[in-house]
């Protein structure tokens, strides 16, 4: 039987390796049954998650799932860090797992490291 609770489909310990200067969309896949919940993004600062107020967000609707998108236009070096989306549903706060953005400031395309290299070269990270 399919649950009618709101569910947020961000994988635990998920990561995205992205480049400063590029556009990027961070998606929070949201499953709900009737009324679409109010969803917000926050950025982790230690143990607290600071709500992102003045950031461009949008919804993308698909047949079985909706996506609440945080837009980075463009990605900046200080966008590096961990993010979480949260949904308000029937007075309950449902929090996603956090997802981490690793931002590299690469001067030219020829210098772009692979995902594996970025994971193993923390000095590239801001």
């Amino acid at each position: 039987k399919e649950s009618c609770d709101v569910q947020l489909y961000i994988k635990r310990q998920s990561e995205h390796s992205i480049l400063a200067g590029d556009p990027f969309e961070l998606e929070c896949p949201v499953k709900y049954c009737a009324n679409r919940p109010h969803v917000t993004w926050c950025k982790l600062n230690g143990t607290t998650c600071v709500k992102l107020e003045d950031r461009q967000t949008s919804w993308k609707e698909e047949k079985n799932i909706s996506f609440f998108i945080l837009h980075f236009e463009p990605v900046l070096p200080n966008d590096n860090g961990s993010y979480r989306c949260s949904a308000n549903f029937q007075s309950n706060l449902i929090e996603s797992h956090s997802t981490t953005l690793y931002v590299t400031d690469v001067k030219s395309a020829s210098e772009r490291p692979s995902k594996d290299e970025m994971a193993s070269r923390p000095w590239l990270l801001y």
């Epitope: 569910q7 947020l8 489909y9 961000i10 994988k11 635990r12 310990q13 998920s14 990561e15 995205h16 390796s17 143990t47 929090e95 797992h97 956090s98 995902k115 594996d116 994971a119």
Partner: antibody
Framework: EVQLVESGGGLVQPGRSLRLSCTTS????????IHWFRQAPGKGLEWVGR????????KYTASFKGRATISADGSKSIAYLQMNSLKTEDTAVYYC????????????WGQGTLVTVSS | DVVMTQSPLSLPVTLGQPASISCRSS???????????LNWLQQRPGQSPRRLIY???KRDSGVPDRFSGSGSGTDFTLKISRVEAEDVGVYYC?????????FGQGTKLEIK
């Protein structure tokens, strides 16, 4: 029915490379992390690393970094483990496993494939 | 790396009797999301491992309720209330809180 089937094992000479495949069915591979583990004869389990088929991100145990490459083709529901510069001590049964990434709802293991590194 | 230490390494048990396996981690397995990612696997002779317990105490579907997991932080236990012949095999704890993920050495359960 959920299935994970490893293939590509066998006898390989030291210094050579090998690519193992893990063919999955019965679930959406992109909702999971694909892990590779190995078990040397008569020994315990060791985590090699994992891949996120949704975006290609990979993590490895330090001793495998640079020598192992884990990848996945989400459209074909197949994951791969490429092992280079094989040594005799890499002789083991290699297992793939698929763990649901959002709520830990399932953790499926394949039957394993034996890799024997010997001259 | 997080070191996982199981005891005992060998566990002879009489059929119908209880069994208990301990697993200790070298650092806390409590993640920042408030959950503890400690799993127990069973490997029967000649078979591949299967997940028995996840998130310390949640039983996988199809796992008999004679299996239970408990613990927190760094100290965890797998209990079998009444051992049956089909329970023979090696039991492993493994953590997926911290990279790299690590295993205990395994506990071999056999019938006396």
């Amino acid at each position: 029915e959920v299935q994970l089937v490893e293939s590509g094992g066998g006898l390989v000479q030291p210094g050579r490379s090998l690519r193992l495949s893990c063919t999955t069915s019965g679930f959406n591979i992109k909702d999971t992390y694909i892990h590779w583990f190995r078990q040397a004869p008569g020994k315990g389990l060791e985590w090699v690393g994992r891949n996120d088929p949704a975006n290609g991100n990979t993590k490895y145990t330090a001793s495998f970094k640079g020598r192992a490459t884990i990848s996945a083709d989400g459209s074909k529901s197949i994951a791969y483990l490429q092992m280079n510069s094989l040594k005799t001590e890499d002789t083991a049964v290699y297992y793939c496993a698929s763990y649901e990434g959002y709520y830990e709802r399932f953790g499926y293991w394949g039957q394993g494939t034996l890799v024997t590194v010997s001259s | 790396d997080v070191v996982m230490t199981q005891s005992p390494l060998s566990l002879p048990v009489t059929l119908g009797q209880p069994a208990s396996i301990s697993c200790r981690s070298s650092q806390s397995l409590l993640d920042r999301d408030g959950k503890t990612y400690l799993n127990w696997l069973q490997q029967r002779p000649g078979q591949s491992p299967r997940r028995l317990i996840y998130l310390v105490s949640k039983r996988d579907s199809g796992v008999p309720d004679r299996f239970s997991g408990s613990g927190s932080g760094t100290d965890f236990t797998l209990k079998i209330s009444r051992v049956e012949a089909e329970d023979v095999g090696v039991y492993y704890c493994w953590q997926d809180t911290h990279f790299p993920y690590t295993f205990g050495q395994g506990t071999k359960l056999e019938i006396k």
